[in-house]
């Protein structure tokens, strides 16, 4: 991973584009920390394992988060 101690945040760019929950392998929500003062959302896609930084402020991404958490709550007993 191209990472040095001076890199504070993971996302160089962020995407507003809606992501189909079915195409998601994993969704990571990285809370703000001493290293990066903002929330970062990283989607790992099933296709080729591509990772995409998402815009936490985007309406489409907020809807995605809701859909994913709803799906999780359905699965958990």
């Amino acid at each position: 991973v191209p990472l040095s101690r001076t890199v504070r945040c993971t996302c160089i760019s962020i995407s507003n584009q809606p992501v189909n929950p079915r195409s998601l392998e994993k969704l990571e929500i990285i809370p703000a920390s001493q290293f990066c003062p903002r929330v970062e959302i990283i989607a790992t896609m099933k296709k080729k394992g591509e990772k995409r930084c998402l815009n936490p402020e985007s309406k489409a991404i907020k809807n995605l988060l809701k859909a994913v958490s709803k799906e999780r709550s359905k699965r958990s007993p």
Epitope: V1, P2, L3, S4, T6, V7, R8, C9, T10, C11, I12, S13, I14, S15, N16, Q17, C36, P37, R38, I42, A43, K48, E50, K51, R52, C53, L54, N55
Partner: antibody, heavy 124, light 109 residues
Framework: QMQLVESGGGVVQPGRSLRLSCTAS????????MHWVRQAPGKGLEWVAV????????FYVDSVKGRFTISRDNSKNTLYLEMNSLRAEDTAIYYC?????????????????WGQGTTVTVSL | EIVLTQSPGTLSLSPGERATLSCRAS???????LAWYQQKPGQAPRLLIY???SRATGIPDRFSGSGSGTDFTLTISRLEPEDFAVYYC??????????FGPGTKVDIK
């Protein structure tokens, strides 16, 4: 359509300064990392600097560290390159380029939109 | 620092022929960090391939990328007149820095 337009190039004497600008349109500028890439006459491409979408990180090629500063004003959709202590070897076409949507340190989507470039000539 | 080497320096081919361009890295590069660009005289570069093998938006399917580790390839299956240009590979490496190869010129035989 997505567009980047550079300005600010010109002829300058060694040791002097110059500020390049790059104005973006057709996309949400504040969402994308931005780069400066240069090309000396008859030579290949050389990456110069990058700035994260929110300005949180900035990185430079070794040859310009301490002399060049990349910055951005998201309210004006504009990217800047402040160039100090210019040298003859800085003579080049300077392009600004957009980092692809969603790029991060774990996956790189390439520089997907480029300006037409502005020419900087450092000469006595 | 990773150094990229491209070969051949110049490739002389005719329209309709297949072009195979090589990009070799001095150390292993994750395919997630490898891109290819095309540049025509007097024009800005254009992104062709990212992630070693994914075509950028609007790029015709005659362009394909492959490879892993230290060896990567850009293939143009059937050269069209507009494909004669210089091609650069590029990697995103630690620090982080974004290094370009020296380029391969594809010209008309």
């Amino acid at each position: 359509q997505m567009q980047l337009v550079e300005s600010g190039g010109g002829v300058v004497q060694p040791g002097r300064s110059l500020r390049l600008s790059c104005t973006a349109s057709g996309f949400t500028f504040s969402n994308n990392g931005m780069h400066w890439v240069r090309q000396a006459p008859g030579k290949g491409l050389e990456w110069v600097a990058v700035i994260w979408f929110d300005g949180m990180n900035k990185f430079y090629v070794d040859s310009v560290k301490g002399r060049f500063t990349i910055s951005r004003d998201n309210s004006k959709n504009t990217l800047y390159l402040e160039m100090n202590s210019l040298r003859a070897e800085d003579t080049a076409i300077y392009y600004c380029a957009r980092e692809g949507d969603g790029s991060g340190i774990y996956y790189y989507y390439g520089m997907d939109v480029w300006g037409q470039g502005t020419t900087v000539t450092v000469s006595l | 620092e990773i150094v990229l080497t491209q070969s051949p320096g110049t490739l002389s081919l005719s329209p309709g022929e297949r072009a195979t361009l090589s990009c070799r890295a001095s150390q292993s590069v994750s395919s997630s960090y490898l891109a290819w660009y095309q540049q025509k005289p007097g024009q800005a570069p254009r992104l062709l391939i990212y992630g070693a093998s994914s075509r950028a938006t609007g790029i015709p399917d005659r362009f394909s990328g492959s490879g892993s580790g230290t060896d990567f390839t850009l293939t143009i299956s059937r050269l069209e007149p507009e494909d004669f240009a210089v091609y650069y590979c590029q990697q995103y490496g630690s620090s982080p820095i974004f290094t370009f190869g020296p380029g391969t010129k594809v010209d008309i035989k």
